[in-house]
C-alpha cells in the first residue's frame, strides 16, 4: 500500500540509486501511452472494429484489439452511441470491455420499455477501468447489439481510448 | 508510434540533450493543467455558461469556452444532470462537446419515450474527449433543451472538466 | 492561474532550488496514488462497502470509505450497474459521492418511467470528480436503492476508483 | 425577514383530506425547499415532505401513499394535502424554510424558518 | 426511516456542562454531516440551533455546540442558564433525500 521510492524518498546514499540523478531520472514515471480510436463505419460482428487512424502513441492496434507495448496502470474508458428502432419488446444493450479476450467490465441499459414501437430511442453507454496491463495485453469491446450502434448519424460518438497512468518499470 | 525520448531512452552521449540532466529535466511531462466547473445558475442559450470560480489551473475561462493555455494531449469530460418534465411525447436530450466551435463528439438519449405525462424523469448524460489541443483552443458545451439542466435543486452536477495528460513541448 | 515553477521554467540561478538538480527533482510531480474497488457481495445499508482487495496504492480502505494518504488533485470516478424489477411507479436511481460525509457530487436517473410491471430494466449510471483532496480526507459512495445494485450477476461492474493527477507538495 | 404563516380548516373529519397553505412573505418562495413538519400534542416532530420552488418533492416513505406538496409561486404559497386521514393525523403542523445554500457544495442545513404552526384535529 | 433516538430527559444545575445524545443508523448520522439541532419552549415553534454538525447560526450562543462519532450525535450545552430549559431535537439528512427527527429530551435546569 506504500508508495515505491519517488524523488521524495529516494535513498541518497547507497541503496539502488544513490546521487546518481540519471538513474534517478531513468525511474521516473516519465512514459505516456494513449489511444483514442473512433468505432469502424461498417460493423459486422459482436466484437468491434476501429479506425486505425485514430490517436495512437505507444499502443498498437490489431484485428480489433488495443495492443500494449508498455506494461503499467492504464485507464481505459469506452463510450458507444446507440440508436434503437423500438421493436414490440424491450431491448438490452450492452458493453463488454474485455482484456486478453476475458470479459473484465461490462455495462447494461434497457431501452424502449414501454413496449411502445416508437420511432427511434437513443441511448448512450460508458465503461471505465483502471488495470494494471502488461505487453502484449489485448483490450477490446463487444456489443451484442452492434446493429443498434449508431456508426452513421453519429460516427464520432463511439470510441475506445486508453492511458497509461503509471509505468511499472 | 514509439515514445519520443525519455529518461529511459535518453541518449547519453552527444544528440539533444547529451547528459545535461537539466535539460533532460526540462523536457520531462512536468506541466499540469486543469480545470473543474460548475454550470451558471441561469442559463438562457443552448451554449452553456460555468461559474468561472471553479478550479481553473493553466487554462482560461471566457464567455463560455475553456481556453487552452498550454499545448498538449488533454482528457475532457462533461457531465450534465437533466430533470425534464415529460409532455405527451418522447424527448431527445443531447449534449454536444465543441472544440473550436466544431461539434467534436456529442452525446443523446431519450427520455419520456413512453408517451405518458410522467411529473418528472431524470437523466444524466456524460461525454469524454481525448484530444490534441494548441494554444487559444477553445471548448464549449451545447446543449438543445437546455432548460432541462437541472440547474437549481442538482447545482453542483452539472460540470465541464479537463485535465493534461501529456504535454506537448 | 498560473503554473507553480515546473522545470520548464525553474530558476537557474538563486531562489528556491537554483540548480541543486536533486531539489529540482524531489518537487516534481512523481506521486502516484490510486485505488480500483468493486463493491461488496452483500449490501446491506445505503452506504456502499467495497471489496478491500482490489487495487490500492497510497490510499487506504477503512468502514466503506477510501481515505487519502498524500495531498493533491484528484480524479475520482464510480460506476454503478442497478437491475430493478420494475414496481407499478417509476424508480429514481441516485449515485451520491461524498467527501467526509458532505455530498459533493450525485447522478439520477428514472427508470420504469411507462408504469409497467416489466421482468428486468437494466440501468447504469456513473459520476465523477474533479477535487482537491487533503490527508485523511474520506470518500464514499451512497445509494438510496442499494438492493437495486446488481452484485450477483455482474459483481465487477460496481465500482468506485481514484487516482491522483496532481501532488500538491 | 423572512415569515411563514400557515392557514387551512381546523377540523378534518376522518378519512378526508386534511389541506394546509402556508404564505411566504417577505422573501421569495423561489430556489429553495419547504418542508411541512407535525407535532401530535405532548409528543415529537414528525417530517411529513419537502417541495422545491421548481414543484420537486420529497416526502417521508411511510405517508408517501397518502402525501400531495405542491407550490404556486406566482403567489409565494406552499401547501401540503394529507388524503385519508385518521385521528392518528391530529397534530399541530408546521410549515419551514430549508437552509439550503449551495456555494461549492450542498449544505442540508436543516429548517432556519418556521411558521408558528397551526393545530389541526381529526374527528367525526 | 426509524426517528432517531434521544434521552426523554436530562438535568443539570446553572454553571454546568451538559450533553443530550442522539443515535441514528448508517443510513442518516452514520453517512451524512447533515445534522441538525432545534430547541423548542412549550406552545412555540422549533428553533435552528446548530446545523450541519457543528456550525451555529447567527445569534446563537458560542455555548451551544455539536459533534459526531459513528452514528450518534451530540448537543452540549456549557455554562448551564435558566433559559435553557426547554425541549430539545436533533435531526439528520437521510438516504432517499429526506429528514428524520429525534424523539426529543426534556432539559431540566435544577
Known amino acids: 500500500d506504500s508508495i515505491p521510492n519517488s524523488p521524495d524518498n529516494v535513498p541518497l546514499k547507497g541503496g539502488d540509486c544513490s546521487e546518481d540523478l540519471l538513474c534517478i531520472l531513468k525511474r521516473a514515471p516519465f512514459k505516456k501511452s494513449w489511444a483514442y480510436l473512433q468505432v469502424a463505419k461498417h460493423l459486422d460482428k459482436t466484437k468491434l472494429s476501429w479506425n486505425k487512424d485514430g490517436i495512437l502513441h505507444g499502443v498498437r492496434y490489431q484485428d480489433g484489439n488495443l495492443v500494449i507495448q508498455f506494461p503499467g496502470l492504464y485507464f481505459i474508458i469506452c463510450q458507444l452511441q446507440f440508436l434503437v428502432q423500438c421493436p414490440q419488446n424491450s431491448v438490452d444493450l450492452k458493453l463488454e470491455l474485455l482484456i486478453n479476450k476475458h470479459i473484465k467490465k461490462q455495462a447494461l441499459v434497457t431501452v424502449c420499455e414501454s413496449g411502445m414501437q416508437t420511432k427511434h430511442v437513443y441511448q448512450n453507454l460508458s465503461q471505465f477501468l483502471l488495470d494494471y496491463l502488461q505487453v502484449d495485453t489485448t483490450i477490446s469491446v463487444n456489443v451484442d447489439t452492434f446493429q443498434y450502434i449508431d456508426t452513421s448519424t453519429f460516427p464520432l460518438e463511439n470510441v475506445l481510448s486508453i492511458f497509461l497512468y503509471s509505468n511499472s518499470d | 508510434d514509439s515514445i519520443p525520448n525519455s529518461p529511459d531512452n535518453v541518449p547519453l552521449k552527444g544528440g539533444d540533450c547529451s547528459e545535461d540532466l537539466l535539460c533532460i529535466l526540462k523536457r520531462a511531462p512536468f506541466k499540469k493543467s486543469w480545470a473543474y466547473l460548475q454550470v451558471a445558475k441561469h442559463l438562457d442559450k443552448t451554449k452553456l455558461s460555468w461559474n468561472k470560480d471553479g478550479i481553473l489551473h493553466g487554462v482560461r475561462y471566457q464567455d463560455g469556452n475553456l481556453v487552452i493555455q498550454f499545448p498538449g494531449l488533454y482528457f475532457i469530460i462533461c457531465q450534465l444532470q437533466f430533470l425534464v418534465q415529460c409532455p405527451q411525447n418522447s424527448v431527445d436530450l443531447k449534449l454536444e462537446l465543441l472544440i473550436n466551435k466544431h461539434i467534436k463528439k456529442q452525446a443523446l438519449v431519450t427520455v419520456c419515450e413512453s408517451g405518458m405525462q410522467t411529473k418528472h424523469v431524470y437523466q444524466n448524460l456524460s461525454q469524454f474527449l481525448l484530444d490534441y489541443l494548441q494554444v487559444d483552443t477553445t471548448i464549449s458545451v451545447n446543449v438543445d433543451t437546455f432548460q432541462y439542466i437541472d440547474t437549481s435543486t442538482f447545482p453542483l452536477e452539472n460540470v465541464l472538466s479537463i485535465f493534461l495528460y501529456s504535454n506537448s513541448d | 492561474d498560473s503554473i507553480p515553477n515546473s522545470p520548464d521554467n525553474v530558476p537557474l540561478k538563486g531562489g528556491d532550488c537554483s540548480e541543486d538538480l536533486l531539489c529540482i527533482l524531489k518537487r516534481a510531480p512523481f506521486k502516484k496514488s490510486w485505488a480500483y474497488l468493486q463493491v461488496a457481495k452483500h449490501l446491506d445499508k445505503t452506504k456502499l462497502s467495497w471489496n478491500k482487495d482490489g487495487i490500492l496504492h497510497g490510499v487506504r480502505y477503512q468502514d466503506g470509505n477510501l481515505v487519502i494518504q498524500f495531498p493533491g488533485l484528484y480524479f475520482i470516478i464510480c460506476q454503478l450497474q442497478f437491475l430493478v424489477q420494475c414496481p407499478q411507479n417509476s424508480v429514481d436511481l441516485k449515485l451520491e459521492l461524498l467527501i467526509n460525509k458532505h455530498i459533493k457530487k450525485q447522478a439520477l436517473v428514472t427508470v420504469c418511467e411507462s408504469g409497467m410491471q416489466t421482468k428486468h430494466v437494466y440501468q447504469n449510471l456513473s459520476q465523477f470528480l474533479l477535487d482537491y483532496l487533503q490527508v485523511d480526507t474520506t470518500i464514499s459512495v451512497n445509494v438510496d436503492t442499494f438492493q437495486y445494485i446488481d452484485t450477483s450477476t455482474f459483481p465487477l461492474e460496481n465500482v468506485l476508483s481514484i487516482f491522483l493527477y496532481s501532488n500538491s507538495d | 425577514q423572512v415569515q411563514l404563516q400557515e392557514s387551512g380548516p381546523r377540523l378534518v373529519k376522518p378519512s378526508e383530506t386534511l389541506s394546509l397553505t402556508c404564505t411566504v412573505s417577505?422573501?421569495?418562495?423561489?430556489?429553495?425547499?419547504w418542508s411541512w413538519i407535525r407535532q401530535p400534542a405532548g409528543k415529537g416532530l414528525e417530517w411529513i415532505g419537502r417541495?422545491?420552488?421548481?414543484?420537486?418533492?420529497n416526502y417521508k416513505p411511510s405517508l408517501k401513499s397518502r402525501v400531495t406538496m405542491s407550490v404556486d409561486t406566482s403567489k409565494n404559497q406552499f401547501s401540503l394535502r394529507l388524503n385519508s386521514v385518521t385521528a392518528a393525523d391530529t397534530a399541530v403542523y408546521y410549515c419551514a424554510r430549508e437552509r439550503a445554500t449551495v456555494t461549492t457544495r450542498y449544505h442540508y442545513d436543516g429548517m432556519d424558518v418556521w411558521g408558528q404552526g397551526t393545530s389541526v384535529t381529526v374527528s367525526s | 426511516q426509524s426517528a432517531l433516538t434521544q434521552p426523554a430527559s436530562v438535568s443539570g444545575s446553572p454553571g454546568q456542562s451538559i450533553t443530550i445524545s442522539c443515535t441514528g443508523s448508517s443510513s442518516d448520522i452514520g453517512t451524512y454531516n447533515y445534522v441538525s439541532w432545534y430547541q423548542q419552549y412549550p406552545g412555540k415553534a422549533p428553533e435552528l440551533m446548530i446545523y450541519?454538525?457543528?456550525n451555529r447560526p447567527s445569534g446563537v450562543s458560542d455555548r451551544f455546540s455539536g459533534s459526531t462519532s459513528g452514528n450518534t450525535a451530540s448537543l452540549t450545552i456549557s455554562g448551564l442558564q435558566a433559559n435553557d430549559e426547554a425541549d430539545y431535537y436533533c435531526s439528520s439528512y437521510s438516504s432517499s433525500s429526506t429528514w428524520v427527527f429525534g424523539g426529543g429530551t426534556k432539559l431540566t435546569v435544577l
Open positions: 417541495v422545491y420552488s421548481s414543484g420537486l418533492t
Open positions: 450541519e454538525v457543528n
Open positions: 417577505g422573501g421569495s418562495i423561489t430556489n429553495n425547499y
